[in-house]
């Protein structure tokens, strides 16, 4: 249903070796980074926090897709994570490395 | 080209009558809001102020389309504009009604 | 304020498996790290492995396979288990929050290994 | 995989100043921070310096780390050594592979 489409935080589980990032990530080996997704339609949902340009954007595309597209769900709160990693070659530890993961989505 | 398909501002006029808005905005008829249009494919570039949890959803993305979505072209930044407005009555203006267009696009 | 407290056995068979939790209070497990630490009667410290606060894990390799963390994030415990105790397994297992640095520790619990 | 040595004890004078060595066995000193805890008998470890030469809140600052490239060590400096200071220090370090690594230890005993 559209309801169940709708912009809303979802699992992914980012595995540092997958993306390469292991050659300075010692630990830990990945993480859950989460991601956005679903759809922003009008009239858009007051926990997803809209931005003015965001309602009248979506209003618009509504009205006219042709006009403007659709408002896009995106992260709009992060969270750091702890790593390990290698700074010019020392092992170092860093407890708040920021913005690596999810912890609201909304639509802008 | 690609690099013309890119996350960038583009314009988006708004006409308050066309979405409803003129029963409350007395002025201006319409403002130019812009709209963020376009991909973020890894690697994205730095005038799109990419958080790390957008780089990594690129990259994962693109070594996986079905693990991961595309960051997203939203606006990440926002202006105000000057209206005359209707308040419970009585034609009030506001210098700075805030959120209104889109100054700067980025990968979120 | 902050606590951590394990709970387990005081006495487990060799060859059996060895269940902990950690309990936690006074934080988030999503925001702070919880290692794992253990050390046999006069001797020293040993860490065996981090629940990290982004739901990664990492192990001591010394443990090899017999090793597994996990955590409820609802219900604010970290669990250890390992499988295929040995007597030389006997040891008082800690569990120790990670910020800046490790700032908290759970009084530990002596668990030994012994038919 | 390096290993952290430390020796097993030593004994110091109250209001003496003492200094305990953790010698990496392979590899460079500097190439990751140092940790050191504190562990009273039957007690609880406590952390004691943090990135090798930081000071947790509520930790004297008769406790100071460094660092000694030439011996490839760090150091724990106990200055105005006191009756409670009495316990056994763990040295710690990071490495790519055992990520989080201890000394042995070494029991300080004050006369």
């Known amino acids: 249903n559209a309801k169940g489409n709708y912009c809303k935080r979802t699992p992914l589980y980012i595995d540092f070796k997958e993306i390469g990032w292991d050659s300075w990530i010692i630990a830990p080996p990945g993480y859950e980074a989460y991601e956005c997704r679903g759809v922003c339609n009008y009239p858009l949902a007051e926990h997803l926090t809209p931005t003015k340009h965001a309602i009248i954007q979506a209003l618009v595309h509504l009205k006219n897709s042709q006009k403007a597209s659709k408002a896009c769900c995106v992260p709009t709160k992060l969270e750091p994570i702890s790593i390990l990693y290698l700074d010019k070659g020392v092992v170092t530890y860093k407890f708040k490395y920021e913005g690596m993961a999810v912890s609201e989505c909304g639509c802008r | 080209n690609a690099k013309g398909n890119y996350c960038k501002r583009t314009p988006l006029y708004i006409d308050f009558k066309e979405i409803g808005w003129d029963s409350w905005i007395i002025a201006p008829p319409g403002y130019e809001a812009y709209e963020c249009r376009g991909v973020c494919n890894y690697p994205l570039a730095e005038h799109l102020t990419p958080t790390k949890h957008a780089i990594i959803q690129a990259l994962v993305h693109l070594k996986n389309s079905q693990k991961a979505s595309k960051a997203c072209c939203v606006p990440t930044k926002l202006e105000p504009i000057s209206i005359l407005y209707l308040d419970k009555g009585v034609v009030t203006y506001k210098f700075k009604y805030e959120g209104m267009a889109v100054s700067e696009c980025g990968c979120r | 304020q902050v606590q951590l407290k394990e709970t387990g056995p005081d006495l487990v068979q060799p060859t059996q498996t060895l269940d902990i939790t950690c309990t936690v209070s006074?934080?988030?497990?999503?925001?702070?790290?919880v290692h794992w630490v253990r050390q046999p009667p006069g001797k020293g410290l040993e860490w065996m492995g981090t629940?990290?606060?982004?739901?990664?894990?990492d192990y001591n390799s010394a443990f090899k396979s017999r090793l597994a963390i996990s955590r409820d994030t609802s219900k604010s415990e970290v669990f250890l288990k390992m499988d295929s105790l040995q007597t030389d397994d006997t040891a008082k297992y800690f569990c120790?929050?990670?910020?800046?640095?490790?700032?908290?520790w759970g009084q530990g619990i002596m668990v030994t290994v012994s038919s | 995989q390096f290993a952290l040595i430390q020796s097993d004890s030593m004994s110091t004078s109250l209001g003496s100043t003492v200094t305990l060595s953790c010698k990496r066995s392979?590899?460079?000193?500097?190439?990751?921070?140092v940790y050191w805890y504190q562990q009273h008998e039957g007690r609880s470890p406590t952390t004691m310096i943090y990135?090798?030469?930081?000071?947790p809140d509520g930790v004297p600052d008769r406790f100071s780390g460094s660092i000694d490239s030439s011996s490839n060590s760090a150091s724990l400096t106990i200055n105005d050594v006191q009756v409670e200071d009495e316990a056994i220090y763990f040295c710690?370090?990071?490495?790519?592979?055992?990520?989080?690594?201890f000394g042995g230890g070494t029991k300080l005993t004050v006369l």
């Open positions: 120790a929050r990670l910020g800046y640095y490790v700032d908290y």
């Open positions: 629940m990290w606060n982004g739901g990664g894990i």
């Open positions: 006074g934080f988030s497990l999503t925001t702070y790290n």
């Open positions: 710690q370090s990071f490495s790519s592979g055992i990520k989080f690594i």
């Open positions: 990135d090798g030469d930081k000071r």
């Open positions: 392979t590899g460079n000193i500097g190439s990751s921070y």
